[in-house]
Amino acid sequence: ASNFDCCLGYTDRILHPKFIVGFTRQLANEGCDINAIIFHTKKKLSVCANPKQTWVKYIVRLLSKKVKNM
């Protein structure tokens, strides 16, 4: 769901935090069409997720906490 570093859509799977090592935010007003969270997985994949979905917010919060505590 990503093209030229821009997400064009969202994954239809829910991912577990154990699978995710980090994320980046994509903003629609910064050259891409949609807002997205790009999760970086342990399999070196980039997964585009909907920032409005609860599970996405949960993982972002978890990862942000981890960074704060480092």
């Epitope: 577990h16 699978f19 409005k52 609860t54």
Partner: antibody, heavy 120, light 107 residues
Framework: QVQLQQPGAELVKPGASVKMSCKAS????????MHWVKQRPGQGLEWIGL????????NYNQKFKGKATLTVDTSSSTAYMQLSSLTSEDSAVYYC?????????????WGQGTSVTVSS | DIQMTQSPASLSASVGETVTITCGAS??????LNWYQRKQGKSPQLLIY???NLADGMSSRFSGSGSGRQYSLKISSLHPDDVATYYC?????????FGGGTKLEIK
């Protein structure tokens, strides 16, 4: 205490639809996912899908897309699953179960299950 | 989809024995694995979450271990009350697939 109440049984005719309910109590309904799981007689557990009551987001097992439709009524803390175009393969016990981020996405409370029998 | 393979499918053991049930995933699931216990005529219950954590209210005779693609559930000092079917479940990504189950009986 947390409770998920489901009707005990439904008898339906082949080709018809059934809508079963799952009434939640004892917790904040919108803070947890609701999963639905199928168990056919003498068989294992099959994950049908989940709904997030906070935003009505649904995620289905591809196998059940077009067969199951998950909805919620947050005002009554009730989740629903509708099964359409029923055949004998749909005869099973269907459980609603609470999905909890806090226990590694585990299903920590289960309803008693609704037994669906498809028969003419 | 991630496939989960449980073994054995059935198991008979004596009271006081220790038994082990294994669960294999078709790919690395990074410890995102849960175990459930289903007693005859009852709804399933969460037993172990995150591969190793004991769920509230479950006996400490149950323990989970494993990583990557291979996981196991150990029941020590078997009680008659442990008669049930045990299921593993992948929660790494949807669809959340279950193993085929292991039916435990007492000799």
């Amino acid at each position: 205490q947390v409770q998920l109440q489901q009707p005990g049984a439904e008898l339906v005719k082949p080709g018809a639809s059934v809508k079963m309910s799952c009434k939640a109590s004892g917790y904040t309904f919108t803070s947890y996912w609701m999963h639905w799981v199928k168990q056919r007689p003498g068989q294992g557990l099959e994950w049908i899908g989940l709904i997030d009551p906070s935003d009505k987001y649904t995620n289905y097992n591809q196998k059940f897309k077009g067969k199951a439709t998950l909805t919620v009524d947050t005002s009554s803390s009730t989740a629903y699953m509708q099964l359409s175009s029923l055949t004998s393969e749909d005869s099973a016990v269907y459980y609603c179960t609470r999905g909890n981020y806090g226990v590694d996405y585990g299903m920590d409370y289960w309803g008693q299950g609704t037994s669906v029998t498809v028969s003419s | 989809d991630i496939q989960m393979t449980q073994s054995p499918a059935s198991l008979s053991a004596s009271v006081g024995e220790t038994v082990t049930i294994t669960c294999g995933a078709s790919e690395n699931i990074y410890g995102a694995l849960n175990w459930y216990q289903r007693k005859q005529g009852k709804s399933p219950q969460l037993l172990i979450y995150g591969a190793t954590n004991l769920a509230d209210g479950m006996s400490s005779r149950f323990s989970g271990s494993g990583s990557g693609r291979q996981y196991s559930l150990k029941i020590s000092s078997l009680h008659p009350d442990d008669v049930a079917t045990y299921y593993c479940q992948n929660v790494l990504s949807t669809p959340y697939t279950f193993g085929g189950g292991t039916k435990l009986e007492i000799k």
